[in-house]
């Protein structure tokens, strides 16, 4: 069921002021401009659907051009509580407080929100990325230090009349790249409070949010150029499958990754590609404008539908899963890295997937919608697709039930 016309009140079809409010650099995430404090301090904030803290640089750091200066804000309130967030590689820590927050190219509202003022970090900020903080848009369950810290979007919905929904259109770089910068500029839109029909083509297809922590979904089938990987569908969701705008790659569980790469190799003339390419370490290049997209297969993920025994599929092109890498030495080459990688924490549908689609995070109805993005990079022969319905039985069995552990042992 596409549910195209049954929009709730407040879901206008056009959000002109929010269109094109995201910027970024290929592989370094998408950011939105936000203001914090009184008088307002402007910061660029990474949009991350894979975490739930609003955290901003609040101390000098070599990679930050600017940072949140709490002492200059008359509306800052200290919560007298620390927060520490370790990642597999790197970490950040800081002090919790609240302040007034708004999004200049967003809804015309100001809300009081929790803010983690980052005072110390390691391998978190990216040199030249142009963002100074992170906006975690997932649910309170994964907020740090615990689920009592209300995430920004919850505060926004609670304090205003904005509907409990947002949508993301991430527009990948493609070529030609901006020759004056080391990495290609990217753009996109974060629509807060609804759906903008100008940002997608065709129909929106919805998949249930399995559990409100990450934006967890269930993948029921995977195909490479129409060839089923034929794995137990539990493997696709081991130990979860999430939609995460803060991750660059499509990340797949080890077994699934190995099967997918084997299938991609078999479906394409890539016998001579260096092994390091498939590990995402080495690039491959072609003379500018001659990338043989046709030799690479499409990747299709089938997602659980809203109706029993019904699924739909989203299909991405090599234009999404080969990430353009600007080589500063020469502009005569189009170079790429393989942006599908291995994961030990389940499937992560990162920018590689999201750049093909307009993605609707319909929190009110506990579902995520996918439609073909009006800005996705494609060629004259193939396009990204969202298609359905397909009959798929026993989809509930595809979900993996994570054994309950002490949450403090979890790594982000």
């Amino acid at each position: 069921e596409t549910d195209e016309e049954s929009e709730e009140p407040g879901r206008r079809g056009s959000f002109v002021e929010m269109v094109d409010n995201l910027r970024g650099k290929s592989g370094q995430g998408y950011y939105v401009e936000m203001t914090v404090g009184s008088p307002p301090q402007t910061l660029n904030i990474l949009v991350d659907t894979g975490s739930s803290n609003f955290a901003v640089g609040a101390a000098p750091h070599p990679f930050l051009h600017r940072y949140y200066q709490r002492q200059l804000s008359s509306t800052y309130r200290d919560l007298r509580k620390g927060v520490y967030v370790p990642y597999t590689q790197g970490k950040w820590e800081g002090e919790l407080g609240t302040d007034l927050v708004s999004i200049p190219h967003g809804p015309n509202v100001t809300v009081r929100a929790n803010i983690a003022a980052i005072t110390e970090s390691d391998k978190f900020f990216i040199n030249g990325s142009n963002w100074e903080g992170i906006l975690g848009l997932a649910y309170a369950e994964i907020a740090r230090p615990d689920d009592s810290l209300e995430p920004f979007f919850d505060s926004l919905v609670k304090q205003t009349h904005i509907p409990n929904i947002f949508s993301l259109q991430l527009c990948g770089a493609g070529f030609p790249l901006n020759q004056t910068e080391a990495l290609a500029s990217v753009g996109g839109s974060m629509i807060i409070g609804g759906i903008d029909h100008s940002l997608y083509t065709g129909s929106l297809w919805y998949t249930p949010i399995r559990r409100e922590w990450y934006y967890e979904v269930i993948i029921v089938r995977v195909e490479i150029n129409g060839q089923d990987l034929k794995m137990d569908c539990k493997e696709y969701n081991y130990d979860k499958s999430i939609v995460d705008s803060g991750t660059t790659n499509l990340r797949l569980p080890k077994k699934v990754f190995e099967a997918a790469v084997k299938s991609i190799k078999a479906a394409s003339s890539t016998e001579k590609f260096p092994d390091g390419f498939w590990l995402g370490e080495q690039l491959v290049c072609w003379q500018a404008g001659t990338t043989p997209w046709n030799i690479f297969p499409v990747i299709s993920l089938y997602l659980m539908g809203e109706v029993t025994n019904q699924s739909f599929r989203i299909t991405i092109l090599p234009q999404q899963y080969l990430r353009p890498v600007e080589d500063v030495a020469t502009s005569q080459d189009d170079c790429y890295k393989f942006a599908v990688s291995q994961s030990s924490t389940g499937t992560v549908m990162g920018a590689v997937i999201m750049e093909g689609f307009y993605v609707v995070f319909d929190r009110a109805r506990k579902r995520i919608g996918f439609a073909v993005s009006a800005c996705h990079v494609h060629d004259e022969f193939r396009t990204a697709a969202v298609e359905g319905p397909f009959v798929t039985a026993d989809m509930e069995d595809c979900g993996y039930n994570i054994p309950q552990t002490d949450e403090s042992t979890l790594m982000t």
Epitope: F273, Q282, P292
Partner: antibody, heavy 119, light 107 residues
Framework: EVQLVESGGGLVQPGGSLRLSCAAS????????IHWVRQAPGKGLEWVGW????????DYADSVKGRFTISADTSKNTAYLQMNSLRAEDTAVYYC????????????WGQGTLVTVSS | DIQMTQSPSSLSASVGDRVTITCRAS??????VAWYQQKPGKAPKLLIY???FLYSGVPSRFSGSGSGTDFTLTISSLQPEDFATYYC?????????FGQGTKVEIK
């Protein structure tokens, strides 16, 4: 501008050794393969072997396997062809050529360097 | 090894003529075939790749066709600068091999 410049050719006695160099510029060295192709006087083209500078993997024609070794120095954007146990039939102009990993063709070539094996 | 047999080994033609060179592989190579042009004392130049794709900068009078074992290079209207030797090359999963060459001379 893409450029491949071979050097190191010359006269060598049968059983001797020679190392040819191929200096590359104007493209992303790590993003392509480098092939060696030879052409005996008045004859056709014969593929000798190739290297992926990024991964170091190599392949060789049966006629040179065990005698020739291809290597690359990525810091210098240079590929090498080490030729040992040379025979009279190895006399040829040796070309290095750039090739994408797929399709496996040679899209830019050097000017060639002549290797003469004679006593 | 896969053998590539070119025919004819040489041909004489006039400016404006349509010229066809064929290449036969000793086994199925799908469309993994390229064509090169070489002039005396010069390095070869890529003309066609993947059997029928014209390489960038190559004049449209050159075209390629074929799949499996039989391949053709066609020059629709021979120009003075086209007098040269032409080589086919196969490049499937195996090691690449070249045809013996076809010399196109002025009649």
């Amino acid at each position: 501008e893409v450029q491949l410049v071979e050097s190191g050719g010359g006269l060598v006695q049968p059983g001797g050794s020679l190392r040819l160099s191929c200096a590359a510029s104007g493209f992303t060295f790590l993003g392509y393969g480098i092939h060696w192709v030879r052409q005996a006087p008045g004859k056709g083209l014969e593929w000798v072997g190739w290297i992926s500078p990024a991964g170091g993997s190599t392949d060789y024609a049966d006629s040179v396997k065990g005698r020739f070794t291809i290597s690359a120095d990525t810091s210098k954007n240079t590929a090498y062809l080490q030729m040992n146990s040379l025979r009279a039939e190895d006399t040829a102009v040796y070309y290095c050529a750039r090739g994408p990993f797929s399709p496996w063709v040679m899209d830019y070539w050097g000017q060639g360097t002549l290797v003469t094996v004679s006593s | 090894d896969i053998q590539m047999t070119q025919s004819p080994s040489s041909l004489s033609a006039s400016v404006g003529d349509r010229v066809t060179i064929t290449c036969r592989a000793s086994q199925d190579v799908s469309t993994a075939v390229a064509w090169y042009q070489q002039k005396p004392g010069k390095a070869p130049k890529l003309l066609i790749y993947s059997a029928s794709f014209l390489y960038s900068g190559v004049p449209s009078r050159f075209s390629g066709s074929g799949s499996g074992t039989d391949f053709t290079l066609t020059i629709s209207s021979l120009q003075p600068e086209d007098f040269a030797t032409y080589y086919c090359q196969q490049f499937p999963t195996y090691l690449p091999t070249f045809g013996q060459g076809t010399k196109v001379e002025i009649k």
